[in-house]
Amino acid sequence: VLPAKPENISCIFYYEENFTCTWSPEKEASYTWYKVKRTYSYGYKSDICSTDNSTRGNHASCSFLPPTITNPDNYTIQVEAQNADGIMKSDITYWNLDAIMKIEPPEIFSVKSVLGIKRMLQIKWIRPVLAPHSSTLKYTLRFRTINSAYWMEVNFTKEDIDRDETYNLTELQAFTEYVMTLRCAPAESMFWSGWSQEKVGTTEEEAPYGLDLWRVLKPAMVDGRRPVQLMWKKATGAPVLEKALGYNIWYFPENNTNLTETVNTTNQTHELYLGGKTYWVYVVSYNSLGESPVATLRIPALNEKTFQCIEAMQACLTQDQLVVEWQSSAPEVDTWMVEWFPDVDSEPSSFSWESVSQARNWTIQKDELKPLWCYNISVYPVLRDRVGQPYSTQAYVQEGIPSAGPVTQADSIGVKTVTITWKEIPKSKRNGFIKNYTIFYQAEDGKEFSKTVNSNILQYRLESLTRRTSYSLQVMASTNAGGTNGTKINFKTLSISHHHHHHHHHH
């Protein structure tokens, strides 16, 4: 049977190394050898490249080597497959070397900022040695911030034939480390070089970018002063490397700038004690190059009525995120402040907050929150300088079974009844939302019964027990992940009710 017609011929010119063509089929059933016929020097010359089954094992590839690789040039390539039954020729294919040339990657030797030019890096590289000297090269420069996985790209061409070339990458973030890699190709070629080795550079530092500012209003003290916990952090979008030397805070009662007070701190939080009026608070960060723009916050008067616009809120889990969504009756509100902290019996050690704009949802990666911990999440609407009533919810990113079951006791033991009381499990041991409680009870050598009640019930009266019988009992608290039994208790029903016994005595 004749060999299959060679098809899908694909050729690539590795500059000053070889001209290689591949084709299909890659494997023939019977002993097959291939002859690749080439015309070159614009059709003036021709030669062949042979693969032999015995030595190359049906290898559907053949390479032409220097010195017969001329550039620029147009080649024709035709593959002949031959076996014992005959020859099958491919169609003739036409190749312009400029269009299929692959060269070595360039070598970046420096990525530096230029003194006095902000948000720019100058990349210097050496053009590949193995590249046609006179041809225009096109380049792709890939860059990303050092802690990002997302590459950005910029394309450009260079016509000059300097060995040492430069490109100024602008509109970067200040004081940020960038990773760079570069590839190139002759302008007409469809084949790019590999990527150069990565090189890192840092943009120049600037005055701080800005601050996000928030507060926690605490109840007024006996003397009427209000503690206000101020907190701030680098604004979203600020350079990762940005460091402030310190922060200046100034504040005053509304319409009374004469009473301005100032504070300087190196912390990112500060407690103020304010009167009952409305106050304005301003914070700037500074470094050796200057100050950030001012962050402003209005602290409402103690008796001010705050607006309410959040009507409902849902927290739901995706595979790797916690998503909180809310509905609002005020379409003009498009900024929200989200607070979240663990719901623990003691004062929360970690308190987090984040601003949300032009959205009515907030997302956090699950791995930023601890599993088995309950988080309080509050959303405040912010309309210009006014902060509205928060709406709060609770969420777990992962539930588990409770670490301990309920502590249980039997009260009011009767002849056929008993009242069981149990305590709520401490927050730190719940590991999830308690869905329900199940009371398991069993007479000595008898069948086990159970009764499930809602999570808001902490007491239950069991009836229809057998008189003068020993019972064992335990209460299980359940979350979505499963249940945990409390300590087992024993009690014995009475033989005669106290009430009945008393009555008889009086007779």
Epitope: K37, T39, S46, N74
Partner: antibody, heavy 117, light 112 residues
């Protein structure tokens, strides 16, 4: 329309020189190898010389090496053949031909060169 | 270097089929493409077959080319001979030893 027009032929004495020209039109001259092919009266075709696109490479049959020089002027789209030390066996019709990718795809009408005393 | 040998003449009657062989003296006939040219008296040659068996679009499909490695030769076949086919036919290939084209001696086709 591709056209190749030869000129410069005629009668010349043995040992003397002659220069043939070929004016090309209708295509990008600088993209093609070009050739001179001759045909002695009542004889077959015989390749004489070829030249690369930029003129940097030239090729000759053995019998004319050192006597004939092929050249081109891409700006004028013209091919030349300088023939020195002419011999009677150089008598022939000289054709200017374009090397296509796989064959001589265009030929001129030819110009007669007679070498005789 | 090699030579390409053709018969001096071939004849065939009108509407018949003829084949003109072109034998390569050394080296493999398949190593370089073979082209065929037709030349009418007093006219420049025109190509009728290139790359062994390819036909330019303007040439009649009565013309076909082939190569045969066993006889180390190429062949031009013309079917349904016409009076206008009467001409000289030359085979041509590339010789890497002389770095140039080689023509066969030519075959005069007479249509009877």
């Amino acid at each position: 329309e591709v056209q190749l027009v030869e000129s410069g032929g005629g009668l010349v004495q043995p040992g003397r020189s002659m220069k043939l020209s070929c004016a090309a039109s209708g295509f990008t001259f600088s993209n093609y190898y070009m050739a001179w092919v001759r045909q002695a009266p009542t004889k077959g075709l015989e390749w004489v010389a070829s030249i690369s696109t930029g003129g940097g490479n030239t090729y000759y049959r053995d019998s004319v090496k050192g006597r004939f020089t092929i050249s081109r002027d891409n700006a004028k789209s013209t091919l030349y053949l300088q023939m020195d030390s002419l011999r009677s066996e150089d008598t022939a019709t000289y054709y200017c031909a374009r090397h296509g990718t796989l064959y001589f795809d265009y030929w001129g009408q030819g110009v007669m060169v007679t070498v005789s005393s | 270097q090699f030579t390409l040998t053709q018969p001096k003449s071939v004849s065939g009657s009108l509407r018949s089929t003829i084949t003109i062989p072109c034998e390569r003296s050394s080296g493999d006939i398949g190593d370089s493409y073979v082209s065929w040219y037709q030349q009418h008296l007093g006219r420049p040659p025109i190509n009728v077959i290139y790359a062994d068996d390819q036909r330019p679009s303007e040439v009649s499909d009565r013309f076909s080319g082939s190569i045969d490695s066993s006889s180390n030769s190429a062949s031009l076949t013309i079917t349904n001979l016409q009076m206008d086919d009467e001409a000289d036919y030359f085979c041509q290939s590339y010789d890497s030893n002389i770095d140039g084209p080689v023509f066969g001696g030519g075959t005069k086709l007479t249509v009877l």
